[in-house]
């Protein structure tokens, strides 16, 4: 069955070399005295990407990250020595790793770093306007960074700066044990989550923080924290990790008698991302790695995209789950988790819930309390004892939209772009991995909007060495993606339409919402452009319908590549053919000489099929003929290559190989009559090459031939160039074996 392609593999797989060669990646490979380019702040208005790293803060031009400014912000020698004396690593820990980088106001950024295990913060002046070209550290104004940045650079921090107040989830101590969600800066006393209470936070790893409006009244605004933490005893048998969403009211100022300077509105719920399994046992992806909020039209209801991995060391997998804020709110309005003692199970709280309901923001909308300090004691007492909700938040459609379990990498980051296509809107996900690759995935609705099909468009290697992607930002203005890792920063366009191919069908099969066939090329699709020639079908990727009128248009069509190969009787030969699309299935047909009929090749001991092509062993005369390589994708058939194989019998070969190099002596075989002397040398070499028992020496053999060819060229000024051209072609083909993507320009053919 050739109808179903390999949907779980990327259609295009581009190596770092290919990305560079096709001008599809710009990389900043870091400074010798810096690393850890993990903290990103995108400023679309100024067209800058601010990046916090080790001892440095960078300001990159969004158009081209090769153009950048930098601030050096190291720690003092004294501070570094103190850190070293405390037993910390001088290179990996005793430096200023920037963990917080936020817009403070119109003219300044706020930045915090680990300060060699002594967190420190300051302000960075960026000026009023982009043309001011200001980027400098306010040296006179350093602040204590505790509760803002962790001490340990290995620890994650989630932060959000709004209205001059910094919300941050971090570790507030040297040992990295006192984790809390803080609110600092501003004019109020700092506020934090309850200390020494694992029910509130249990060794959390903070991912991100977001402000989401609850109503049109800003008093109801909430800050949501995404994190993962150890499951509380009784929640799970054995040690387990749970993904969480936590909420706090922006106008929470703590309690009056109890929970003084502590959050009174903190609640958390579990985020489930799992696949139903046999016997009712689900496969859980519990290790939340990253979160992206897709704001579209209604800022009160963004779609939450979460990247998860499995906790197990044996079974490695990754998934992307989508959540709706209405589902999140429903859980926070549901039952609280309750248990009567450490040896009891968690149950939904059945008793009377005090008024106003814990977790509700004090506002005119939901009751008459002006401040959390006015909340009744029973509300505060209840809130302190019941920070967790009983019900979890399930993903939309109750399952992940992307799952990867059969690969040697795990997901680390995600950004999402909503793209207008001919047949609707699509969310295109860019997923970063721990090996430095970016996956471009589109989720396509099938029968219903909830029932989504994942289509993996591209897998791109964006760093020279495999390195975990730790930060990603997407600029809709520039249509570029920015990627951070320990090694550096990379920039790549959101779309590479021309890379899909030179034909309508290839463009259509790609199912990339950014791209459409414009009548002459695969190019960026703009919904505003009123051109009837635009061909695009994201939902079905059906070129038969959308490109049928172009199939026989020789102006745009390219006939398949044709090759002639000579093989020696009883030896082996390899017919190379690999499609540009990894999702295509290849099948071969054989056509005997002087016959119209084509038969599909069946593999046996004589014929071995590989991803790169066909290996024919122990060649016989009957193997002579035409070999046609076809690619099938989404029901569409393309002929990629036509190879004519000529099998030479052994006697004929012996005769050829025993002739002198200068071509003297009579030729009894018809094949040799048309050859020039130099071509005979080439032919002898070629026969030796294809019949050589050790393919590993092929490169050495070719090298010798090229050397001899150059020597002959110097000796004979009037030689025929035919042989060197043929060898050049062979050399290119040899190189091309490892380059699957740009191998041939070929046109699709209709079925």
């Amino acid at each position: 069955n050739y109808q179903n392609g390999k949907n779980n593999v990327p259609r295009l797989k581009l190596s770092y070399k290919e990305m560079l060669e096709s001008n599809n990646v710009i990389t900043f490979n870091g400074l010798a005295n810096s690393s850890s380019y993990h903290t990103f702040l995108l400023d679309e208005e100024r067209s800058r990407l601010y990046v916090g790293a080790k001892d440095h803060i960078f300001s990159f031009d969004l158009v081209n990250i090769k153009d950048f400014q930098k601030i050096v912000w190291p720690v003092s020698y004294t501070r570094r020595d103190e850190c070293k004396w405390a037993g910390k690593d001088i290179l990996k820990e005793c430096a200023n790793f920037i963990k917080v980088l936020k817009a403070y106001n119109q003219t300044h950024l706020y930045a915090c770093g680990t300060g060699a295990f002594h967190p420190i913060c300051t302000y960075i002046e960026i000026g009023h306007h982009p043309e001011d070209n200001i980027f400098k550290l306010e040296n006179s104004h350093f602040e204590n960074g505790r509760g803002k940045s962790p001490y340990d650079p290995k620890l994650l921090t989630a932060s959000l700066l709004i209205d001059g107040e910094l919300y941050s989830g971090t570790a507030a101590d040297f040992m990295g044990r006192d984790f809390a969600i803080f609110r600092t800066l501003g004019h109020h006393h700092p506020i934090r989550t309850e200390q020494h209470d694992s029910r509130w936070l249990n060794d959390p790893k903070f991912i991100s923080a977001h402000l989401i409006s609850e109503s049109d009244n800003p008093e109801d605004d909430k800050v949501y924290f995404f994190f993962r933490e150890n499951a509380i005893d009784g929640e799970h048998s054995g040690k387990a990790t749970h993904a969480r969403i936590g909420q706090i009211c922006k106008n929470d100022f703590g309690g009056h008698r109890s929970l003084v300077n502590k959050w009174t509105t903190f609640l958390k719920a579990r985020l489930i991302c799992s696949v139903p399994g046999p016997n009712g046992i689900d496969t859980h992806f519990d290790e939340l790695q990253d979160v992206f909020l897709m704001n579209f039209k209604d800022p009160k209801n963004p779609v939450v995209y979460g990247v998860f991995t499995t906790s197990s060391n044996i079974f490695k997998g990754s998934a992307v789950c989508m959540y709706s804020m209405s589902d999140v709110r429903r859980v926070f309005l549901g039952p609280y988790a309750h248990r009567d003692g450490p040896n009891y199970q968690w149950v939904p709280y059945q008793g009377r819930v005090p008024y106003p309901r814990p977790g509700t923001c004090p506002s005119k909308t939901f009751g008459g309390f002006d401040s959390t300090k006015d909340l009744p004691d029973d509300v505060i007492t209840f809130a302190r004892s019941h920070p967790a909700m009983y019900n979890p938040v399930f993903p939309m459609n109750n399952r992940p939209i992307v799952i990867k379990t059969d690969v040697n990498y795990q997901f680390t980051q995600i950004v999402v772009d909503r793209v207008d296509a001919e047949d609707g809107q699509y969310d295109v996900m860019f997923i970063g991995t721990d090996v430095g690759t970016v996956l471009k995935v589109v989720s396509i609705p099938k029968e219903t909007w909830y029932d989504l099909e994942e289509v993996l468009l591209e897998e791109m290697t964006v760093f020279r060495e495999p390195t975990a992607i730790s930060a990603m930002e997407l600029s809709t203005k520039q249509q570029q993606l920015y990627i951070g890792s320990t090694a550096g920063v990379a920039q790549l366009p959101l779309h590479r339409c021309d890379i899909y191919g030179k034909a309508c069908a290839e463009c259509c099969l790609a199912r990339d919402p950014y791209c459409a066939w414009d009548g002459s090329a695969c190019s960026r699709y703009f919904p505003t452009a009123k051109r009837r020639t635009r061909r695009q079908d994201i939902r079905n990727g059906d070129p038969l319908t959308h490109c049928s009128d172009l199939h026989h248009d020789n102006h745009h069509g390219h006939s398949p590549e044709e090759r002639i190969i000579y093989g020696v009787e009883n030896s082996s030969t390899f017919l190379e053919c690999s499609p540009k699309s990894q999702r295509a299935l290849v099948y071969w047909q054989f056509q005997r000489r002087n016959e119209e009929r084509k038969e599909e090749i069946r593999v046996d001991d004589h014929i071995i099929r590989t991803d790169q092509g066909l290996l024919l062993r122990s060649l016989q005369q009957k193997d002579s003929g035409n070999y046609l390589c076809h690619a099938v994708e989404h029901g569409f058939i393309q002929t990629l290559l036509k190879v004519t194989l000529e099998v030479i019998d052994t006697e004929h070969l012996e005769e050829l190989l025993h002739k002198d190099d200068d071509g003297d002596g009579s030729k009894t075989k018809e094949m040799s009559n048309s050859m020039t002397p130099s071509q005979k040398v080439w032919y002898r070499d070629f026969m030796q090459l294809i019949n050589h028992p050790n393919l590993n020496t092929m490169d050495e053999f070719c090298e010798q031939v090229w050397k001899r060819d150059r020597k002959q060229r110097r000796q004979r000024p009037g030689h025929t160039p035919g042989n060197s051209n043929k060898w050049k072609h062979l050399q290119e083909n040899k190189k091309g074996r490892n380059r699957r993507t740009h191998e041939f320009e070929r046109a699709p053919r209709s079925v």
Epitope: E82, C83, W85, A86, F117, H118, P119, N144, G145, R146, G147, Y151, A172, D173, F174, M175, R177, D178, A180, H189, P190, R192, Q195, H196, D197, S198, R199, R257, S258, L259, V260, N261, R384, S385
Partner: antibody, heavy 123, light 111 residues
């Protein structure tokens, strides 16, 4: 007015046990973290043990770990310290102290102290 | 041996100014943790004198002030009075093992 009143001290032989109590009044006992701090005769202060408002967090100084047990009964507004396998070096005045967290950074201070109870370990 | 180092004794005449130092390390005071000071009058329980490096609880005279810099903190007493004769202890968070640390104490003698 905040008051902390320790009791239960006395003379005990090495290897013996003792249970100290601290009765709290004048504040919402169930909302506060509580501690035991001791002072050997003529010596400085040493933190012994701490317990969170709901007993979810309990910690001990290395010198008493495995021998002392801190607990509380919020319904009785009382803090306890069960001392087993007592040694001569445990001889001290034992103070009950409330964690105030008065500072900006929530670093524990001890804003109220009891008058102390003397524990003498001697044969 | 206390984790925080204080001078064993200081002295001063009435009306004078004295300071008591408290030196820690990068894993307590130097880590940015707050320093608190206690006064222990002879035969009584300690009393919180300064919290959060420099803040005075209500009822503590403004003659007492605290400061912190790097891995050290200090307590200053101006206009020394006879009733100030006591033992003074500094304390910082260390978390965990031990949870909090005290200085060895400084005996202030008013001459």
């Amino acid at each position: 007015e905040v008051q902390l009143l320790e009791s239960g001290g006395g003379l005990v032989q090495p290897g013996g046990s003792l249970r100290l109590s601290c009765a709290a009044s004048g504040f919402d006992f169930s909302s506060y973290e509580m501690n035991w701090v001791r002072q050997a005769p003529g010596k400085g202060l040493e933190w012994v043990s701490g317990i969170s408002w709901n007993s979810g967090w309990i910690d001990y100084a290395d010198s008493v770990k495995g021998r002392f047990t801190i607990s509380r009964d919020n319904s009785k507004n009382t803090l306890y310290l069960q001392m087993n396998s007592l040694r001569a070096e445990d001889t001290a005045v034992y103070y009950c102290a409330r964690s105030g967290y008065s500072s900006s950074w929530f670093d524990p201070d001890f804003d109220y102290w009891g008058q102390g109870t003397l524990v003498t370990v001697s044969s | 041996q206390s984790v925080l180092t204080q001078p064993p004794s200081v002295s001063g005449a009435p009306g004078q100014r004295v300071t008591i130092s408290c030196t820690g390390s990068s894993s307590n005071i130097g880590a940015g943790y707050d320093v608190h000071w206690y006064q222990q009058l002879p035969g009584t329980a300690p009393k919180l004198l300064i919290y959060g490096n420099s803040n005075r609880p209500s009822g503590v005279p403004d003659r007492f002030s605290g400061s912190k810099s790097g891995t050290s903190a200090s307590l200053a007493i101006t206009g020394l009075q006879a009733e100030d004769e006591a033992d003074y202890y500094c304390q910082s968070y260390a978390g965990p093992n031990p949870y909090v640390v005290f200085g060895g104490g400084t005996k202030l003698t008013v001459l």
